[in-house]
């Protein structure tokens, strides 16, 4: 468990309930030892994960962990779906679990649904 393999700590079956029009940061927690790997985000389209090009991304450092962040400025209804980050480490590709964004379009929602309502979707 303390090996120097790159680890991508996106939780299996994780999700985020968010609203169109709001800003949102999707974080990929990355553990590495010496050299920070190259990390990318992709969006799932069926079984294919389509690489997200030209998007605003950044790094954040916390104690033992770095976070590769995908910025949504703002969230669009079309951002609904599942995302995965992957790291290029020693010429091997390490893929995270996918995380799902449930986007509520506030134009079509008379009021913002509660977290419980969104979680039950």
């Amino acid at each position: 468990k303390e090996s120097c393999d790159v680890q991508l700590y996106i939780k299996r079956q994780s999700y985020h309930s968010i609203f169109a029009g709001d800003p949102f940061k999707l974080e990929c927690p990355v553990k590495y030892c010496a050299h920070r790997p190259q990390v990318t985000w992709c969006k799932l389209n069926g079984t294919t994960c389509v690489k997200l090009e030209g998007r605003h991304t950044s790094w954040k450092q916390e104690k033992n962990l770095s976070f590769f962040i995908l910025h949504f400025e703002p969230v669009l209804p079309s951002d609904n779906g599942s995302y995965r980050c992957s790291a290029n480490f020693l010429s091997a590709i390490i893929e995270s679990h996918s995380t799902t964004l449930y986007v509520t379009d506030v134009k079509s929602a008379s009021e913002r649904p509660s977290k419980d309502e969104m979680a039950s979707r």
């Epitope: 994780s14 985020h16 104690k63 893929e95 995270s96």
Partner: antibody
Framework: EVQLQQSVAELVRPGASVKLSCTAS????????MHWVKQRPEQGLEWIGR????????KYDPKFQGKATITADTSSNTAYVQLSSLTSEDTAIYYC??????????????WGQGTTLTVSS | DVVMTQTPLTLSVTIGQPASISCKSS???????????LNWLLQRPGQSPKRLIY???KLDSGVPDRFTGSGSGTDFTLKISRVEAEDLGVYYC?????????FGGGTKLEIK
Amino acid sequence: EVQLQQSVAELVRPGASVKLSCTASGFNIKNTYMHWVKQRPEQGLEWIGRIDPANGNTKYDPKFQGKATITADTSSNTAYVQLSSLTSEDTAIYYCALTYYGSSQHYFDYWGQGTTLTVSS
Amino acid sequence: DVVMTQTPLTLSVTIGQPASISCKSSQSLLDSDGKTYLNWLLQRPGQSPKRLIYLVSKLDSGVPDRFTGSGSGTDFTLKISRVEAEDLGVYYCWQDTHFPQTFGGGTKLEIK
């Protein structure tokens, strides 16, 4: 080293509620799922549910919906389960367990020592 | 819910002899991501459970290699090549492919 600290025992009257705690050290619970598992005397294990402390999202086994409420406080690195309307059927050991996901898919990696809950008048 | 059925209920084994525990699920545990989320836990007397094996056959760190997990779909097996005194306790299989997560009823390993 990861440790999960739970209180040893609780004695509660029927009809009352109780809130059990589980404090993690050696790991930031924001990067994990925190689970609660029930074990009645001389019986097997039952999964109650889990929380994603990063965003408060919860999932419960339907049979514990309404009975258990799982919360987390990331500032104290602590997860809680509140059990309501207690009866003798709730007398059991309650374990917390910490699951984290990396590229090698670790989960249910660490368990607390359990809190023995006795419901008795 | 997925029902996990373990056999036997109790296993009485002489130290140094092999042991085998079966776990059958009521539906396939192969997930859409291609992985099978089947784990084995050991609960020693008076202790909390400890995971031995995850993803059917991967040994947790510190688990002796006399333990092996195998199987696919709905049929899984935990084998101990040579039982030692520290192996006694209750073994549980547990699935995390389908919601809600469910455990087998447990197999008690006794030393003869």
